[in-house]
Every structure is written in C-alpha cells, then in structure tokens.
C-alpha cells in the first residue's frame, strides 16, 4: 500500500533526524498529503525557511559555527517581508548577528550562503555602515528608526539568528 510505505519512510526519516533535532513540527503543504514540510521545534517558519533565535552570546564566527552544526547558517535576509517576520521574535534591547560580513574591510559585503549582496535590498540604519574595521553586521532596534542593520566588530559577542531551508519528508 502506497500510503503505508510513505508513512513508514516518513517515520524513519523523523527518527533519523532526531539525532540532530529532537523534535520537528511538520505541516502538510498544499492538497497533497505526500508533502510535509518541517521545522525543528521551537524554530519558527516563514515561507520556505525555518528560523532560530540563539540567545547565547558569541562572536560572529562562533555564531555561524553554531548554526552550521544544526544544518543552518546565520540568517540571510532577502526581502522586507522576511525582515518584518524576523523582528517579531527579537527583543528590542538586544542585537543579533546576521549572515553578512565584509572580511576584507573593503565594503565588499557578502552573505554567508553566497547570495549576491544587493544594495537595493538592505536595511542599514542611517549612517551605517560607518567603520571599515567593523566587518560584521547585526540587526538591532533604534528608537528613532525602529529595526535596522549596523556594522560592528566581529569578535564582540552577540545573540544571533540562524536560518535553514524547511525539511521536507
């Protein structure tokens, strides 16, 4: 029976993934019972991605390593809608690393997943970025401008946001 074998395969996948993410929250996508999209619990989901707010304070490199161990990366923000979703889960008195850095200090910003950096889809606070030695980007809240990006020193510990594609089983 097709449905039975599909369910057995799905359960097997869920068991296999438990070693990385002990619990997954899955939803049926569309009309087809075959397609389940999952995010680890308690990650949040938006469109085809899952997001995790890491409250541990670490350097940018360690934050990225922490995300990659989970099969994710520091967040790459592609649209205003995506940023609007992300900020719903952030605390105003905290700053969070993004997956955006300028390793050479030459204002050649690059996303960790090689998504091309598009100047037209950036949300820097006014006057930012403003320091060639500050080579990593955070998102934070400023009362005058709400949420936006700022460049900071990469070694200064911050909270962070991880992003991964939804897991399809």
């Amino acid at each position: 029976n097709f449905m039975y074998s599909k369910t057995v395969k799905r359960l097997s996948k869920l068991r296999e993934y438990q070693q990385y993410h002990p619990s997954l929250t899955c939803v049926m996508e569309g009309k087809d019972i075959e397609d389940w999209s999952c995010c680890p619990t308690p990650w949040t989901s938006f469109q085809s991605s899952c997001y995790f707010i890491s409250t541990g304070m670490q350097s940018w490199t360690k934050s990225q390593k922490n995300c990659s161990v989970m099969g994710a990366d520091l967040v790459v923000i592609n649209t205003r809608e995506e940023q609007d979703f992300i900020i719903q889960n952030l605390k105003r008195n905290s700053s969070y690393f993004l997956g955006l850095s300028d390793p050479g200090g030459r204002r050649h910003w690059q996303w960790v997943d090689q998504t091309p950096y598009n100047e037209n889809v950036t949300f820097w606070h006014s006057g930012e970025p403003n320091n060639l030695d500050e080579r990593c980007a955070i998102i934070n809240f400023r009362s005058s401008e709400e949420w936006g990006w700022n460049d900071i020193h990469c070694h200064v510990p911050q909270k962070s946001i991880c992003k991964m594609k939804k897991i399809y089983i």
């Epitope: 296999e16 993934y17 070693q19 990385y20 490199t61 990225q64 390593k65 990659s68 161990v69 989970m70 099969g71 990366d73 960790v112 997943d113 090689q114 991964m164 594609k165 897991i167 399809y168």
Partner: nanobody
C-alpha cells in the same frame, strides 16, 4: 560530532594522478554534504569541490573542473577526490569538511558553512 580523516596525500610527479580519501565516523554520514578545500603555503584555504548527501549533485571550482572529480560511497562512509594531470600549483594541504544538510544541495563553497573538518593531507607535486 563527526570525525574526518583524510588519506592519500604524498609526493607526486607532475602530470601524475592521485585519489584522496576522507573517512567519516560519528554521526550518520548520509546526512552530511561533504566538501574538499585546499591550502597552499602562505595562501588562504580555497574551495575545491562539494558533493550532496546522496552524491547526485556535485559542485566544483571552475578552474579545477577539468581535472578534479568528487565522489562518495555512503556504504563506506567515505568521500573521494580524484585529481588528474597534477602540476606544482596543486601543491597544498587538502582538507575534507562536513556539513549537515537536509536536502540534496552541493552548493556549499564557503569554509564558514562547514561545521566539521579533518586534519588535512599534504600533496606535493614535483616538476
């Protein structure tokens, strides 16, 4: 944790071939995309090749495509890098790396995206 151990390096004559191996232990190998990087003396570590969890998808650095092949044997928990027509510019320490991946992508070209690394194997090409 994933442990990675490279082997197959050594001294090779220019024009020769070499197959590097990387044996993985620890977690379920089939859930990890694998990559090869290399680092020549005084240079930054550079991307060589990557392969998806199933082995169906591969991605190689443009400049190396013609001579390098990446493959994996999930039954043996091993990933391979076959190098042909070696030249002195290929002299480097070759590292293998693993990245947890829940899809079948091989587009992982940045060192930052790999959580686990081997110690490396030295390849020296003499002219």
């Amino acid at each position: 944790q994933v442990q990675l151990q490279e082997s197959g390096g050594g001294l090779v004559q220019a024009g020769g071939s070499r197959r590097l191996s990387c044996a993985a232990s620890g977690r379920t190998f089939i859930n990890y995309a694998m990559g090869w990087f290399r680092q020549a003396p005084g240079k930054e570590r550079e991307f060589v090749a990557a392969i998806s969890t199933s082995g169906s998808n591969t991605y190689l650095a443009d400049s190396l495509k013609a001579r390098f092949t990446i493959s994996r044997d999930n039954a043996k928990n091993t990933v391979y890098l076959q190098i042909r027509s070696l030249n002195p510019e290929d002299t480097a320490v070759y590292y293998c790396a693993a990245r947890l991946s829940f899809d079948d992508s091989a587009y992982y070209t940045s060192t930052l995206r790999y959580a686990y690394w081997g110690q490396g194997t030295q390849v020296t090409v003499s002219s």
